[in-house]
Every structure is written in structure tokens, then in C-alpha cells.
């Protein structure tokens, strides 16, 4: 099948101890071989500080999955979630102010 | 992207060294960490810090009561400055841009050497 | 901090050879491993990164593979123009930390 980029959404949730899990989630791709990973001032966060869901098939011949880490509150502007598929990459951030969640289809 | 590290090649004991990286072809504000990095004689290098593309700095937990990187956006430069230097300061600093992994780009390096 | 172990220090080969150099680390890094090239008059180039990308103009003669603690740069054939020090990076656990070293000369 011919590629499908994906749409990525990054959400947050609600303040714990002065932190908030911070969720990039990338949905409707293809290939099913991604890139995902959450980023601070640019650098890929350590491998044990995120959590990755399966690459798991949508129902619609695309596939689906995602990454979360923990951050503290007030620092979310150093964070971006980045993405690579088939050639192509993207960043995403961490919406700002009372905004919970944004996404982009990357074409 | 190029990078180029400049300053003092002497510095006394007790002194700070402070040195500037001019960044040329992308903007230290567009993203990514900017790095200073030093190679002490017989190659060993350390890692010293970075400032990010959003002004946050990070720190070698050795140097951080040392060391303080900030920029000059207008001029698309950073600096380092590392105060009470020793002898053991003497190296070779390099300024490097740190992309998601790795550090893509570094400078040519600027020989440091700390003595009376 | 997170100690990696360069292995040999220095070797001489023919050009042509086979090179294979070794990094291990005192911990997991989780494929957060690098490899750089300093030429002797001290110019650093990035070669490979995440364990085994090749950054964009570097020769293909250049590969790298590993997982866990032990990492290792391989070049394929080698030629004139890769006598250098190679130093391997961790980036998984800050502080991010380096090898010591390893200075490829021909025979």
C-alpha cells in the first residue's frame, strides 16, 4: 500500500505533585514502522524516562500507537514530541495554557 | 550549520574562562540543546552542558556550581563561562548542537590552557 | 555516571581491512549509543547515532550495531581518509558520557 502519514495528537493530564503526564499519540499511519519519542530543548529523553504503547493495526488498514512521560509543571514549553515516518518527521508541543490537546496530519 | 568556538588562550588560576560559540545557518531559538563540550590532553572528553533553543539550561551535575551558559539570540551566539578555574581546566573546548540523539554538528575547538 | 569502555585503544590495519571497534557500558543505555570521528587536526564529525543511523553524507562503509551494554562501529573497508580517534556517547542517562577512545592508523 502507498503511505499514509500520521496524525499526531498531544495531550496532557491532570496536575499530580507539581506534574503532569504529558501523551503524543500518532494514529491512521502506514507503514507500520515509526518513530516516536519525547524530546527536552531538542534531546531525545531517556529511554527510561517514557513509556511506549504497541504498534497496534487501527481496523482501517493503518496502524496506531503512542508515548508519554512525566513532566513538571511549568516546564512544558521545553518539551516536543517527535516523530519520524517514512521519510518524513515533525515536532509537536505540549499545549500551552488551558488548551489540552493538539494535532497535525503531516502530509 | 557551522559552529565556532572563540576566546582567551591563557587564563590565570582563579580566574573564569569565559568563551563564545557564533552559530551560523540555523537559529540557536529554532530548537535543539547547544552544547559546550571539552577534551582534556589525552583525548578524554567531558560533557559541560547546554543551553536549549528555549533559553533552559542544563548542566554537568561536576560543573554546575562552575559553570553558566547563556546567549546572545541577536547575534546567534552562546557562551560559556567557568569560574575558579585550575589547572585541570586546561583543554580544548568544542560547541556542538545536540539534535534528538546525537550532536550533529560541532565547532573546530578552541585550545584552553590555565596557568600562571 | 554511566562509564563506557572503549576496546582496542589504538589498532593498525591495511587499508581494505575490516575494523571493528568496541564500547561498553556499566549499565543498560537502551540503543542511546554514537559515534563520532576526530581527524588529528581535531575537526569531530558525527558518523552514526541510536545505535545504528548513519548521519546524512556519512560513507556507508561505516555501520554500527549493538543493544544493552555492548555497542560496536564497523568499518567495512577502510581507507585512507578514516585514520582518525573514534569515540563512542551515551545519551540514555544524564550526565551523557564518552569512551575513551580509538585510534585507527594504516599499516
Known amino acids: 500500500g502507498s503511505t499514509v502519514p500520521p496524525m499526531v495528537n498531544v495531550t496532557c493530564s491532570e496536575v499530580s505533585e507539581g506534574n503532569i503526564t504529558v501523551t503524543c499519540r500518532a494514529s491512521s499511519f502506514y507503514p507500520r514502522n515509526i518513530t516516536l519519542t519525547w524530546r527536552q530543548d531538542g534531546v531525545s529523553l531517556s529511554h527510561n524516562t517514557q513509556q511506549w504503547g504497541d504498534v497496534l493495526p487501527d481496523g482501517n488498514g493503518t496502524y496506531q500507537t503512542w508515548v508519554a512521560t512525566r513532566i513538571r509543571q511549568g516546564e512544558e514549553q521545553r518539551f516536543t514530541c517527535y516523530m519520524e515516518h517514512s521519510g518524513n518527521h515533525g515536532t509537536h508541543p505540549v499545549p500551552s495554557g488551558n488548551s489540552h490537546h493538539h494535532h497535525h496530519h503531516h502530509h | 550549520v557551522q559552529l565556532q568556538e572563540s576566546g582567551p588562550g591563557l587564563v590565570k588560576p582563579s580566574q573564569s574562562l569565559s568563551l563564545t560559540c557564533n552559530v551560523t545557518g540555523y537559529s540557536i531559538t529554532g530548537d535543539y540543546a547547544w552544547n559546550w563540550i571539552r577534551q582534556f590532553p589525552g583525548n578524554k572528553l567531558e560533557w559541560i552542558g547546554y543551553i536549549g533553543y528555549t533559553g533552559s539550561t542544563t548542566y554537568n551535575p561536576s560543573l554546575k556550581s562552575r559553570v553558566s551558559i547563556t546567549r546572545d539570540t541577536s547575534k546567534n551566539q552562546f557562551f560559556l563561562q567557568l569560574n575558579s578555574v585550575t589547572p585541570e581546566d586546561t583543554a580544548t573546548y568544542y560547541c556542538?548542537?545536540?539534535?534528538?540523539?546525537?550532536?550533529?554538528?560541532w565547532g573546530l575547538g578552541t585550545s584552553v590552557t590555565v596557568s600562571s | 555516571d554511566i562509564q563506557m569502555t572503549q576496546t582496542p585503544s589504538s589498532l593498525s590495519a591495511s587499508l581494505g581491512d575490516r575494523v571493528t571497534i568496541s564500547c561498553r557500558a556499566n549499565q543498560d543505555i537502551s540503543h542511546y549509543l554514537n559515534w563520532y570521528q576526530q581527524k588529528p587536526d581535531g575537526a569531530v564529525k558525527l558518523l552514526i547515532y541510536?545505535?545504528?543511523r548513519i548521519h546524512s553524507g556519512v560513507p556507508s562503509r561505516f555501520s554500527g550495531s549493538g543493544s544493552g551494554t555492548d555497542y560496536s562501529l564497523t568499518i567495512a573497508n577502510l581507507e585512507q581518509e578514516d585514520v582518525a580517534t573514534y569515540f563512542c556517547?551515551?545519551?540514555?542517562?544524564?550526565?551523557?558520557?564518552f569512551g575513551g577512545g580509538t585510534k585507527v592508523e594504516i599499516k
Open positions: 541510536y545505535t545504528s
Open positions: 556517547q551515551q545519551g540514555n542517562t544524564p550526565p551523557t558520557t
Open positions: 556542538a548542537r545536540w539534535r534528538n540523539w546525537a550532536m550533529d554538528y
